[in-house]
């Protein structure tokens, strides 16, 4: 495959509501007009697909309705948001970018973003 550089932050801390956002940036070698972005989770040497979306440049990034991911694109950057995260979801989240059209096909895989998720402490019962 023709290789492409993909950059993403090394570490991100999820919010108390279990939401983590990070930017995935790719160095497009040509006039990329259709891009596929896949988020992979690596934990205990297991790699699983979290979500994926294909978008045309200038169009919105659309994940499946039941996806835990949302995102927006701007030029060669994709702003990804993963929601519904819990402490057990802590792991390395890898951004994979494929330039689907026009040919030739390019593939780039980032080094991953370590997302730390801390479950919020349960609120103590209040006496009223």
């Amino acid at each position: 495959c023709k290789a492409m550089h993909v950059a993403q932050p090394a570490v991100v801390l999820a919010s108390s509501r279990g939401i983590a956002s990070f930017v995935c940036e790719y160095a497009s070698p040509g006039k990329a007009t259709e891009v596929r972005v896949t988020v992979l989770r690596q934990a205990d040497s297991q790699v699983t697909e979290v979500c994926a979306a294909t978008y045309m440049m200038g169009n919105e990034l659309t994940f499946l309705d039941d996806s835990i991911c949302t995102g927006t694109s701007s030029g060669n950057q994709v702003n990804l948001t993963i929601q519904g995260l819990r402490a057990m979801d802590t792991g390395l989240y890898i951004c994979k970018v494929e330039l689907m059209y026009p040919p030739p096909y390019y593939l780039g895989i980032g080094n991953g973003t370590q997302i730390y998720v801390i479950d919020p402490e349960p609120c103590p019962d209040s006496d009223f």
């Epitope: 007009t33 259709e34 045309m56 689907m100 030739p104």
Partner: antibody, heavy 120, light 112 residues
Framework: QVQLVQSGAEVKKPGASVKISCKAS????????INWVKQAPGQGLEWIGD????????NSNQKFEGRATLTVDTSISTAYMELSRLRSDDTAVYYC?????????????WGQGTLVTVSS | DIVMTQSPLSLPVTPGEPASISCRSS???????????LYWYLQKPGQSPQLLIY???NLASGVPDRFSSSGSGTDFTLKISRVEAEDVGVYYC?????????FGGGTKVEIK
């Protein structure tokens, strides 16, 4: 159903320009690339270029670079190809075609074609 | 540019009999991602081209299963198991491994 309807036949003199339209219906216009293909009389198919309706970004066959201009008007779901500095060997049927990502970017729907005749 | 070469130029066929068309590319169309960027189109008399096969061997929606396609990285074959009268026309192979997209010269299939 998906339809690509092209403008009618044109007769032009050498050196002139021609602008062909391709009106799409039956699908969301901005979800698919539009390609343009040339077919000279009794000849095969030759790719001219493509356009992304979202941002007007184009890819072109170098053979036509500088003479073929691809544009879109998303408000009326229409793609255009303008060919300038016409020569006799531009006499051909020109097709627009939609690309489909599920078919790995094959052209799944084609217009009926527009015959352009270049003659003095 | 990738050159696509088809043979034969013309193919007289008998209805009910099998037929095959060859296509050769000047460069392997098998990408390291496992996809073969080879397509077949049919242009029936007086009509626009229509998609038959994508990714070398996959039938487009509505294409009868009497059509099949196979090949290596550079040599491809389109087969019709039993030719029907409606199959007449010019068959084109095409590639979109790289720009510019290119087509073969076409094979004209006609009834004997």
């Amino acid at each position: 159903q998906v339809q690509l309807v092209q403008s009618g036949a044109e007769v032009k003199k050498p050196g002139a320009s021609v602008k062909i339209s391709c009106k799409a219906s039956g699908y969301k216009f901005t979800d698919h690339f539009i390609n343009w293909v040339k077919q000279a009389p009794g000849q095969g198919l030759e790719w001219i270029g493509d356009i992304n309706p979202n941002n007007g970004g184009t890819n072109s066959n170098q053979k036509f670079e500088g003479r073929a201009t691809l544009t879109v008007d998303t408000s009326i779901s229409t793609a255009y190809m303008e060919l300038s500095r016409l020569r006799s060997d531009d006499t051909a049927v020109y097709y627009c075609a939609r690309l489909r990502r599920e078919y790995f970017y094959a052209m799944d729907y084609w217009g009926q074609g527009t015959l352009v005749t270049v003659s003095s | 540019d990738i050159v696509m070469t088809q043979s034969p130029l013309s193919l007289p066929v008998t209805p009910g009999e099998p037929a095959s068309i060859s296509c050769r590319s000047s460069k392997s169309l098998l990408h390291s991602n496992g996809i073969t960027y080879l397509y077949w189109y049919l242009q029936k008399p007086g009509q626009s081209p229509q998609l038959l096969i994508y990714q070398m061997s996959n039938l487009a929606s509505g294409v009868p299963d009497r059509f099949s396609s196979s090949g290596s990285g550079t040599d491809f074959t389109l087969k019709i198991s039993r030719v029907e009268a409606e199959d007449v026309g010019v068959y084109y192979c095409a590639q979109n491994l790289e720009l510019p997209l290119t087509f073969g010269g076409g094979t004209k299939v006609e009834i004997k």
